[in-house]
């Protein structure tokens, strides 16, 4: 009586249950009444990450340096290569197929969150009392100088792009 369904890690073919090939191996030939499924290890730079009946292994992902990519984790016969971006760049998608330069925060904006290999810089406008006078991917908004603590007075008010200008207090004539 031939089976109609097979167990986990098996597949039905020619009215019998054959074992799937384990991760890292591809199918060469199906099982017979007397022999088990024939499997072969994936070659160099190839992988299969599941129990399978694939006749070809998948190629490892290529981390193209021309796209700003580098290898974060080398692939094995059971896992794909994981790419990430060169310093100063981040992935354009979750699959990390290409990279773009980290965004800089314009004057008047500071870095809220520094970019990573997978996320861009997050900028925020400098609130009252803070400024940024540079375009940067790292600089936060800086607080205005406190003239009072230097025994000086404000001669020119600060903006979100400029610091206050302090000067000496007027002498009484």
């Amino acid at each position: 009586e031939p089976p109609t369904a097979c167990r986990e890690k098996q597949y039905l073919i020619n009215s019998q249950c054959c074992s799937l090939c384990q991760p890292g191996q591809k199918l060469v030939s199906d099982c017979t009444e007397f022999t088990e499924t024939e499997c072969l290890p994936c070659g160099e730079s190839e992988f299969l990450d599941t129990w399978n009946r694939e006749t070809h292994c998948h190629q490892h992902k290529y981390c193209d340096p021309n796209l700003g990519l580098r290898v974060q984790q080398k692939g094995t016969s059971e896992t794909d290569t994981i790419c990430t971006c060169e310093e100063g760049w981040h992935c354009t998608s979750e699959a990390c197929e290409s990279c773009v330069l980290h965004r800089s925060c314009s004057p008047g904006f500071g870095v809220k969150q520094i970019a990573t290999g997978v996320s861009d810089t997050i900028c925020e406008p400098c609130p009252v009392g803070f400024f940024s006078n540079v375009s940067s991917a790292f600089e936060k908004c800086h607080p205005w100088t406190s003239c009072e603590t230097k025994d000086l007075v404000v001669q020119q008010a600060g903006t979100n792009k400029t610091d206050v200008v302090c000067g000496p207090q007027d002498r009484l004539r």
Epitope: E1, R7, Q25, T35, E36, T37, C39
Partner: antibody, heavy 120, light 107 residues
Framework: EVHLVESGPGLVKASQTLSLTCTVS??????????WTWIRHHPGRGLEWIGH???????SYNPSLKSPITISVDTSKNQFSLRLSSVTAADTALYFC????????????WGQGSLVTVSS | DIRLTQSPSSVSASVGDRVTITCRAS??????LAWYQQKPGKAPKLLIY???SLQSGVPSRFSGSGSGTDFTLTISSLQPEDFATYYC?????????FGGGTKLEIK
């Protein structure tokens, strides 16, 4: 949890028939998909696969064994049995019943073993 | 029939040691090899199947590797309960066969 328990006489006379039964609990033989197997361990020697049966009664036997083999299944009692006829002293061994998830193994559950001595 | 040759036939080691047992098949068996542990008077216990897959509930100090004709079982750090006899079994073709066993003893 799956349990297998072997039962049968511990002493058999040469040229007679060795009969053992394996009672399965925690799994139904009739649910299919497993192969119910007999394996023996000779004193001071290695393990030897005797044969198996599926829930539907399909069998495979080891042709290297000299004594004729019969493995049968009784799904109503959730048991399977081994018969070795015309036994000799070479059939003295610790007999195990086991479960396999494919025709080729591996054997994930085993009985505790039943020692059978063939006397002349 | 496929013959499986295990080596060494016996090995002495201490708790904490790393131990490797090899199993060589007389012909290619892909990755269809299992490893079992057996203690005196007890049933064998499945450790590894499909050459390198760890059976559920088996400690991760046990690992298997190999394909074709050469296979290894490695115990990374021996524990007192690991002293036993180890058998390989080819799951490639009938009749199913076992290796002769490797007895792991306390040094």
């Amino acid at each position: 949890e799956v349990h297998l328990v072997e039962s049968g006489p511990g002493l058999v006379k040469a040229s007679q028939t060795l009969s053992l039964t394996c009672t399965v609990s925690g799994d139904s033989i009739s649910s299919g998909g497993y192969y119910w197997t007999w394996i023996r361990h000779h004193p001071g020697r290695g393990l030897e696969w005797i044969g198996h049966i599926s829930y539907s009664g399909r069998t495979s036997y080891n042709p290297s064994l000299k004594s004729p083999i019969t493995i049968s299944v009784d799904t109503s009692k959730n048991q399977f049995s081994l018969r070795l006829s015309s036994v000799t002293a070479a059939d003295t061994a610790l007999y195990f019943c086991a479960r396999a998830s494919t025709r080729f193994g591996p054997f994930d559950y085993w009985g505790q073993g039943s020692l059978v001595t063939v006397s002349s | 029939d496929i013959r499986l040759t295990q080596s060494p036939s016996s090995v002495s080691a201490s708790v904490g040691d790393r131990v490797t047992i090899t199993c060589r098949a007389s012909q290619g068996i892909s990755s269809w090899l299992a490893w079992y542990q057996q203690k005196p008077g007890k049933a064998p216990k499945l450790l590894i199947y499909a050459a390198s897959s760890l059976q559920s509930g088996v400690p991760s100090r046990f690992s298997g590797s190999g394909s074709g004709t050469d296979f290894t079982l490695t115990i990374s750090s021996l524990q007192p309960e690991d002293f036993a006899t180890y058998y390989c079994q080819q799951a490639n073709s009938f009749p199913l066969t076992f290796g002769g066993g490797t007895k792991l003893e306390i040094k």
